[in-house]
């Protein structure tokens, strides 16, 4: 997250970190069910761990943390690497979470976002771009949903209805390491960090997010079919 600020503790209990060995964060994710996460499909890896209820990026033990293995990864069937359409994936955890103030699911919004909607994006991604700089703790950033026309103008021929753009003033954006993390609008999960300009946070180049309102049926049916 570029030019965000430290999230208040306990305010993002659905935020997950996907870790490669040894405790190397590579993507964010979102708890949407006691045993299921949503993340970006481009975050797919064979072997990874999931950390929930953790505030700092470092692997130091926190009393609220819960660790899991991802036992099943189900990318959306319309996703094709390395494209960005249909960029979402469900991950089944090896067990159900223990609900606490630090770990609980969020509902996926069934309403598509309208321009001007205020949202919050969070993650442990780099705080500088194009060089990489790790934050100490989870970062939060207020962003506004842009109209689909402004989105398409910013990224000609790259935007479809499985994406939406959101941003703020130049110099504020999601970035590397935030992929798969949540965009929360009006208390519901509206999007996942997917892509954006390179380097991040360029003027008139908003972040691009997976438009989850288009996928509520697939999410529900996939969880039911694999539970």
């Amino acid at each position: 997250i570029i030019n965000g600020s430290d999230c208040d503790m306990h305010t993002q209990p659905w935020q997950a970190a996907l870790l490669l060995r040894p405790n190397q964060l590579y993507c964010g994710a979102v708890l949407v069910h006691p045993q299921w996460l949503l993340t970006a499909a481009h975050c797919r890896k064979k072997v990874f761990r999931v950390r929930l209820g953790h505030y700092s990026l470092s692997p130091v033990y926190e009393s609220g943390q819960q660790m899991f293995q991802g036992v099943k990864s189900i990318p959306h069937p319309g996703y094709s690497h390395p494209g960005h359409s249909n960029d979402l994936m469900l991950i089944k955890l090896n067990r159900r979470i223990r609900p606490t103030k630090d770990v609980r699911p969020i509902n996926v919004s069934s309403h598509c976002p309208s321009a001007g909607t205020k949202c919050l994006v969070s993650g442990w991604g780099t705080t500088k771009s194009p060089q990489v700089h790790f934050p100490k703790v989870l970062q939060c950033l207020n962003i506004s949903v842009l109209s689909q026309k402004r989105c398409e103008d910013a990224y000609p021929r790259q935007i479809d209805d499985t994406m939406f753009c959101a941003g703020d003033k130049a110099g504020r954006d999601s970035c590397q390491g935030d992929s798969g993390g949540p965009v929360v609008c009006n208390g519901s999960l509206q999007g996942l960090v997917s892509w954006g300009d390179y380097p991040c946070a360029r003027p008139n180049r908003p972040g691009v997010y997976t438009n989850l309102c288009k996928f509520t049926k697939w999410i529900q049916e996939t969880i039911q079919a694999n539970s």
């Epitope: 964060l25 590579y26 993507c27 390395p82 992929s179 997917s194 892509w195 954006g196 180049r205």
Partner: antibody, heavy 124, light 107 residues
């Protein structure tokens, strides 16, 4: 299958501007999934990264070359270009263009497709 | 600027032997941002390993990468005749840079 082909003059005079073009075939530059790079290799030496460009035109340059480098993209021609000003004999090298994958995960996918390289000699 | 130092400069080995190449960074580099390339005379570099340990498409499993922080290693478990080449590490954590290379030559 994606292919990259560098082209441009093989001989440039000192103090002039070196101009090279990389033509992409079998794939499209206007893709949000990739960035495009220039790398060079002086005779008998190692590789030096020059800079990257995204399809949108956003660039990222090697700090040591930044004052002399311009990388641009022409999506209609499926090409990207390098200009290096005020060249000296030290800029004599094989110049490569390459492609790298890009997303917002904490991950560097490496540069997976390279051109065969073009030799540029700086001499009067 | 992160400087990558590769050692040894030259490695003289016979086919079938194991090759261990080192890449040391002047400051800590996320392992996710480290790649290895192979270059043969007159050819462009070829991506072998990305993310310090993941093999690129079509790369044989005798090539493996490991390491974290400032120390990274490329291992070729059993050298084949076509493996004799120059190998470069690259980091993209800071402004991208390459190591000076290690030449693997036939003993």
């Amino acid at each position: 299958q994606l292919q990259l082909q560098e082209s441009g003059p093989g001989l440039v005079k000192p103090s002039e501007t070196l101009s090279l073009t990389c033509t992409v075939s079998g794939g499209s530059i206007p893709s949000s999934s990739y960035y495009w790079s220039w790398i060079r290799q002086p005779p008998g030496k190692g590789l030096e990264w020059i800079g990257n460009i995204y399809y949108s035109g956003s660039t990222y340059y090697n700090p040591s070359l930044k004052s002399r480098v311009t990388i641009s993209v022409d999506t209609s021609k499926n090409q990207f270009s390098l200009k290096l000003s005020s060249v000296t004999a030290a800029d004599t090298a094989v110049y490569y263009c390459a492609r790298g994958e890009y997303d917002r995960s904490y991950y560097f996918w490496g540069m997976d497709v390279w051109g065969q390289g073009t030799t540029v000699t700086v001499s009067s | 600027e992160i400087v990558l130092t590769q050692s040894p400069g030259t490695l003289s080995l016979s086919p079938g032997e194991r090759a261990t190449l080192s890449c040391r960074a002047s400051q800590s580099v996320s392992s996710s941002y480290l790649a290895w390339y192979q270059q043969k005379p007159g050819q462009a570099p070829r991506l072998l390993i990305y993310g310090a340990s993941s093999r690129a498409t079509g790369i044989p499993d005798r090539f493996s990468g490991s390491g974290s922080g400032t120390d990274f290693t490329l291992t070729i478990s059993r050298l084949e005749p076509e493996d004799f080449a120059v190998y470069y590490c690259q980091q993209a954590f800071s402004s991208p840079s390459f190591g000076g290379g290690t030449k693997v030559e036939i003993k």
